[in-house]
Amino acid sequence: EDWQCPRTPYAASRDFDVKYVVPSFSAGGLVQAMVTYEGDRNESAVFVAIRNRLHVLGPDLKSVQSLATGPAGDPGCQTCAACGPGPHGPPGDTDTKVLVLDPALPALVSCGSSLQGRCFLHDLEPQGTAVHLAAPACLFSAHHNRPDDCPDCVASPLGTRVTVVEQGQASYFYVASSLDAAVAASFSPRSVSIRRLKADASGFAPGFVALSVLPKHLVSYSIEYVHSFHTGAFVYFLTVQPASVTDDPSALHTRLARLSATEPELGDYRELVLDCRFAPKRRRRGAPEGGQPYPVLRVAHSAPVGAQLATELSIAEGQEVLFGVFVTGKDGGPGVGPNSVVCAFPIDLLDTLIDEGVERCCESPVHPGLRRGLDFFQSPSFCPNPPGLEALSPNTSCRHFPLLVSSSFSRVDLFNGLLGPVQVTALYVTRLDNVTVAHMGTMDGRILQVELVRSLNYLLYVSNFSLGDSGQPVQRDVSRLGDHLLFASGDQVFQVPIQGPGCRHFLTCGRCLRAWHFMGCGWCGNMCGQQKECPGSWQQDHCPPKLTEFHPHSGPLRGSTRLTLCGSNFYLHPSGLVPEGTHQVTVGQSPCRPLPKDSSKLRPVPRKDFVEEFECELEPLGTQAVGPTNVSLTVTNMPPGKHFRVDGTSVLRGFSFMEPVLIAVQPLFGPRAGGTCLTLEGQSLSVGTSRAVLVNGTECLLARVSEGQLLCATPPGATVASVPLSLQVGGAQVPGSWTFQYRED
């Protein structure tokens, strides 16, 4: 039977235990918020908030400035002092709930859990390539704010998301806060609001527009705001909330809320349910037809996509897509299928579905039974009526009231379940060349940088490494600064290059030079690295062949052996066709003549495994000595492949030339009819790849082969006679003169 090279798992070409050390900053406490700033004049900064403190870092993550933001009531609290002599409220620690940039000024705005959730504005002062914060301004006017109406109460202790939008000369803060009965009773933050920052930075203009969970639902209906972003003409919030006001509050789903970024009003507030599922290619018995639902959004990010993913999503390159990591429930615990799935929602299609949903509600003829929804924000009503009203009045428009679109937007896991047990806790998507890369942080403190593609049954990793030794979860919010992403884990901030931390996790030259161009990987003799790591020997144009195994491990000194070589970088072409004169194999001093590839034996190799086979016929030279020797493969003048050309030599020890010896044959006679079981004894009888026992020139069918013994069944004899018996190994006769006597049956 043909011997076949053992498959090498694709994973063997990389090592995700390789340690990478990326720049980091120890914040001195659990990182609560982080934001980056890049100015017009090459100045940049990273702002990192922990309990009671705000750090300003330079682009190198070195501390530039530090500001005390609490505890409230403490004389050392620098932000509190900006509000004038106190007391301003109950004393207590300040946990930063909001940290955003107002690009128009530019300024940093921070809002905390203390002092009724008020905010502070810090003008940015460039100093060379670094940035300092000016003295904070307190965004709170005591005479404007009351417990039941507080335009300057922004942050909720339960969590707040803010997106700042410039409209004309004004900055509008799109604010979404989680509420419960206790929070709502204390200086009344709102669920969703749009607030204009006053020009004199004394707070936010009164009379702002807002939506809030109705008091009767506050206890049972809680909305978590996971992410917010601004693209095109809209601001979007992503929420996790109960699927129904009336049913089980633990049955959660994910919604997208859309607000106009051009008009500071909430009449065109729209919500849409996002449905993300894992639909395995082969459905298990009993599995739901549409796939397993993953209703709870954990993290999200929107980004323009590269050409390849755009094609797979049937959209144009550069279009904005919302990516979300979803889990099965709040605890994200394992069910059947992966822990985390990633779904892609093209923004244009989201907008189209919302727009068509609005028209379905508002156009005539009326679609009977269609509800306006959002019963936690407003009185129930049917389309096209406004909330709480039985009919439209002539001076109201159906379109000028909030609406839940009746259809959900459904997508399936981009990774086809391949994230498996990984629990993703952070996500940032970038476009590099024509590739779209998801940079993911995990529950166990790792960073996974993976190409976003649909059509594969394995993950294409840029990298997969541990941020540090703490193993603490990577936090949800990720920021970009130049060509780096900033991830927070525990009390540390880490700076990870978007091109990946390095190339050392690629173990083979082939894998190294097949890496994405943007990674800048090259081969350094025996490792994969970036040019700065090994400037002397670094190259990106060729790989030597790599021998990993061969068969057989021994061959006869006289006679031929069909040698099968295993390894990688033999061909670079799936067909395995070798141009004349490019591959030279020597075993010891003896050449091994390349054999044409038998196309009938070509097997498709799954991309998760890789192995290349090369066959040659070994005919030892007369000068070849018995004993151990090396197998050497040299490849030259190969036409270049897609990523590199093959060029170089690989040597592997462990082949032995042996001389088979035949010592005894028994029995020496048998019936003319044949079928006598002959036993041939000797040494090195199993070497090489072919052997034959000939009785009067006819083959004696081999039943068993071992190093010291051959068993075969004699063929029928023509007459009663003594006939020659010989053993050939590799086509050459083993020395010795033997006869076998055919007798009457």
Partner: antibody, heavy 117, light 108 residues
Framework: QVQLVESGGGLVQPGGSLRLSCAAS????????MSWVRQAPGKGLEWVSY????????YYADSVKGRFTISRDNSKNTLYLQMNSLRAEDTAVYYC??????????WGQGTLVTVSS | DIVLTQSPATLSLSPGERATLSCRAS???????LGWYQQKPGQAPRLLIY???NRATGVPARFSGSGSGTDFTLTISSLEPEDFATYYC?????????FGQGTKVEIK
Amino acid sequence: QVQLVESGGGLVQPGGSLRLSCAASGFTFNSYSMSWVRQAPGKGLEWVSYISSRSSTTYYADSVKGRFTISRDNSKNTLYLQMNSLRAEDTAVYYCARGYFHGMDYWGQGTLVTVSS
Amino acid sequence: DIVLTQSPATLSLSPGERATLSCRASQSVSFDYLGWYQQKPGQAPRLLIYGASNRATGVPARFSGSGSGTDFTLTISSLEPEDFATYYCLQYFNPPHTFGQGTKVEIK
């Protein structure tokens, strides 16, 4: 009420070009995605192309990809189909239709395109 | 591309009878993005069902859609004279969107 009226059909030689228009009225045109569907004489329906409400997303049937271009002018409430390199097999009645997520709920009456030498 | 196969090609029934039309997809039509359309000779098609089972506005209750994944059915509970026409299914989840070849419901 909703109305979709196609125009621009006619006789054209193989390799030639034609531009179909679909004038929409009676609804908020810029809120709806639109499609073109065709029907060869005596044959079934064949979906041709789709465009989203803001024109950012377009889809095409394999049979017309690279030859046909769908577009819209929301200020004029008009949908277009630019057809180049026409072939005999493109001969059909071309319909424009409104909507996507809730099905194509309104259709025009169609315009006949004949490709023949 | 998803191929839709409708059966039977022709259905000969009398008014008042129940009509069951089948549409089978070559691969799963995710989230039931499947519609049914009615077309009479010389007329434009008319939407009957979207999302596999939702009746379009103004469509009589005798029309109902069911199924998911790869097998979908349009049922006309009791045929009226005006229901004799050709019916097409359409998948609109994966571009390119595709129609079935049609089922003609004719008077027996």
